[in-house]
Interface confidence: low
């Protein structure tokens, strides 16, 4: 049997293999040692018994999408049946005082692999070391602490495989410099020691994406905006645009990145070297925001051809929006047509290639409440004898849209612990002036929060107010 027969049934075309060679990986045309690593078909009853106490789940994650040329990292974590864990020596033990289907477990071994292993196992040429090999019969590496590594992980993608010894977690990074853009599948099979052989305990696969466009995501925030996720913002208040570039391997760290903004409101093109930018829309309406991110990254040198002039360095047009489907876990660009780029083997020349990323959004600008202020605070005269509560009248003004609701939160002087919250619809005159009467339970210092809201906005102001005791000479104090 060959690796491809064991690990995956989808044939990987030969012409693709040539373009997508991974450094340190091997062709899945290699032979698989079926004696040391038995192959079980789906539905084989032995899968059920391959692990004591249940099935081991392998969870595979990656930091996809990856820009061509960057590194992409895959992590496999093994999740053991309930009440089982890996100890410091790499053995699998039952957790103390944990209740599983068998009742309470004591701290006994599920698998005590290191107890039977000794350094003599590594003596090459002896029958004892013949089993310390990967499925392609390569011997295991011998780093410090090898005895604690009880699992063999076989990663398989792009018609190639990579073998690794590990504990309950394994990590592999690949460089995407020679890879074709597009979605790919990574499959991982995990084996455990079983006497002098290795049996499969779990299999997992996941999609990852190689892209020739910079994966870009933009967060948009604005003071007084009621809902940050609805892409509705307020007129006459700055919106903060913050560009996040998905670059977990820091491939772009040494590249200068330029951001070209078109806000769709006829204010022209803004070019910036900063990932954050403020912009204020002064008209209501719907606007198409376009961002192009550009950078130069190390790339292939074009073959010398004196007769052909170099192509102009214009950005390609952004991809069409993806069909509505579940989005990938991290922000990604998955254009419908992937360009494949053959990378030359010339690595000693310092050529650079332009890469682009795109972000588009349709944002709606509406009128909102821009500002709230407390104009006046007045003590409401009370009949004699005075009740325990003090009544205060607050005169509040606002700018912008007419609020529909006013909320008052009375809290402790630190403004942390709310004591009372009252919301009510409001009738506001054309000048946006309203009077709010609130009761205070006894003397002391209070924090008073006023929020005025409408469908799109929520504006806030706070003040500290000192309610005097019942001595008629003690004054009311407000500290804004």
């Amino acid at each position: 049997k060959r690796f491809r027969d064991v690990l995956g049934h989808e044939q990987y075309p030969d012409h693709m293999r040539e373009h997508n060679q991974l450094r340190g990986w091997s062709s899945d045309e290699n032979e698989w040692d079926e004696h040391l690593y038995p192959v079980w078909r789906r539905g084989d009853g032995r899968w059920k018994d391959s692990w004591e106490g249940g099935r081991v789940q392998a969870v595979l994650t990656s930091d996809s999408p990856a820009l061509v040329g960057s590194n992409i990292t895959f992590v496999v974590n093994l999740v053991f049946p309930r009440c089982q864990k890996e100890d410091a020596n790499g053995n699998i033990v039952y957790e103390k005082n944990c209740r599983n289907d068998l009742g309470l477990t004591s701290d006994l071994h599920v698998y005590n692999w290191t107890a039977g292993a000794d350094d003599g196992d590594w003596e090459d040429g002896t029958s004892r070391s013949q089993h310390l090999r990967f499925p392609d019969r390569r011997p295991f590496p011998r780093p410090h602490g090898w005895k604690k590594w009880s699992f063999v992980y076989v990663f398989h993608t792009l018609g190639q495989y990579f073998q690794k010894l590990g504990r309950c977690s394994a990590r592999v990074s690949i460089n995407t410099v020679n890879l074709t853009a597009g979605p790919q599948v990574m499959e991982v099979t995990v084996f455990r020691r079983y006497g002098r052989a290795y049996i499969p305990i779990s299999k997992v696969k996941d999609v990852y994406v190689i892209t020739d466009q910079i994966p870009v995501f933009v967060t948009m925030s604005q003071k007084n905006d009621r809902n940050l996720s609805d892409e509705i913002f307020l007129r006459d208040l700055p919106i903060v645009f913050d560009v996040l570039i998905h670059d977990p391997s820091h491939f772009l760290n040494d590249s200068a990145i330029s951001y070209k903004w078109n806000f769709g409101d006829n204010t022209g093109l803004f070019v910036s070297n900063n990932h954050t930018l403020n912009h204020t829309y002064v008209l209501n309406g719907t606007f198409n925001l376009n961002l192009t991110v550009q950078t130069a990254v190390p790339g292939p040198c074009p073959p010398p051809s004196p007769s052909t002039p170099p192509p102009p360095s214009t950005p390609p047009s952004p991809p069409p929006s993806p069909l509505p489907t579940l989005s990938t876990p991290s922000p990604s660009l998955m254009p419908t047509g992937y360009k494949s780029m053959e990378l030359s083997d010339i690595s000693n020349e310092n050529c650079r290639i332009n890469r682009y990323g795109y972000f588009r959004a349709t944002i709606t600008i509406v009128e909102g409440i821009l500002e709230v202020s407390i104009m006046q605070i007045a003590d409401v005269p009370m009949p004699t004898p005075q009740p325990a509560n003090s009544l205060m009248d607050f005169t509040v003004t606002c700018k912008g849209a007419t609020p529909m609701e006013a909320c008052t939160i009375i809290s402790d002087p630190t403004c942390q612990i709310a004591q009372n919250r009252v919301c009510s619809p409001v009738a506001v005159d054309g000048l946006c002036l309203l009077s709010v009467r609130r009761a205070f339970n006894g003397s002391g210092t209070y924090c008073v929060n006023f929020t005025l809201g409408d469908d799109a906005s929520l504006a806030l102001t706070s003040t500290l107010i000192s309610i005097p005791g019942k001595d008629p000479d003690s004054p009311l104090r407000a500290v804004n």
């Epitope: 489907t325 579940l326 876990p329």
Partner: antibody, heavy 120, light 107 residues
Framework: QLQLQQSGTEVVKPGASVKIPCKAS????????MNWVKQRPGKGLEWIGQ????????NDNGKFEGKATLTVDKSSNTAYIQLSSLTSEDSAVYFC?????????????WGQGTSVTVSS | SIVMTQTPKFLLVSAGDRVTITCKAS??????VAWFQQKPGQSPELLIY???NRYTGVPDRFTGSGYGTDFTFTISTVQAEDLAVYFC?????????FGGGTRLEIK
């Protein structure tokens, strides 16, 4: 237009078997998991298992071992569930539902369900 | 297998009310939780995936949150057409398991 088409109703005798089809159209059949979910009348949902048409890989709920077998026919873009040794406990609606490879449990499109009645 | 304990089992609310349903996993399932709506006589429909992501075309009155073992599903302003049974589901561990469901009825 994306569709998962299931047969309407199956009436079968106790001890017999039944094979329920789910015909997919409007998307890349081989690139999505196909899940099967059981729902007894007035009850909740029970996940039976899933199959990846791209390579026939399956991921099963051990509770249905020996009861449910999942297969696919890539040429007709059809997934099947075969239920064997049927009893009254197997009377239920069986849904097929697809899920993307990277979010294999998030079933975003469902068939209309096939009602299986086990009765002598 | 993971047990998903969903509460409450039944909700009787008025149109315009805010509704919260909770789901507790018997062990951590990261953020791999989905929420489904099943209207009478229909197939379930995906509303939320990966705990908090609203599926394409789902109105923004439906939201989800949570991580690890505790998850919450909220309808900010219930409408008459929201009459349905709502299910949570974990898809971190196989077998994937559903909560028992919450029947939402409108007064």
């Amino acid at each position: 237009q994306l569709q998962l088409q299931q047969s309407g109703t199956e009436v079968v005798k106790p001890g017999a078997s039944v094979k329920i089809p789910c015909k997919a159209s409007g998307y890349a059949f081989s690139s999505y998991w196909m899940n099967w979910v059981k729902q007894r009348p007035g009850k909740g949902l029970e996940w039976i298992g899933q199959i990846y048409p791209g390579d026939g890989d399956t991921n099963d709920n051990g509770k249905f071992e020996g009861k449910a077998t999942l297969t696919v026919d890539k040429s007709s873009n059809t997934a099947y569930i075969q239920l064997s040794s049927l009893t009254s406990e197997d009377s239920a609606v069986y849904f097929c539902a697809r899920s993307p490879l990277h979010l294999r449990g998030s079933m975003d499109y469902w068939g209309q369900g096939t009602s299986v009645t086990v009765s002598s | 297998s993971i047990v998903m304990t969903q509460t409450p089992k039944f909700l009787l609310v008025s149109a315009g009310d805010r509704v919260t349903i909770t789901c507790k996993a018997s062990q951590s399932v990261s953020n791999d939780v989905a929420w489904f709506q099943q209207k009478p006589g229909q197939s379930p429909e995906l509303l939320i995936y990966s705990a908090s992501n609203r599926y394409t075309g789902v109105p923004d009155r439906f939201t989800g949150s949570g991580y690890g073992t505790d998850f919450t599903f909220t309808i900010s302003t219930v409408q008459a057409e929201d009459l349905a049974v709502y299910f949570c589901q974990q898809n971190y561990y196989s077998p994937f398991t559903f909560g028992g469901g919450t029947r939402l009825e409108i007064k």
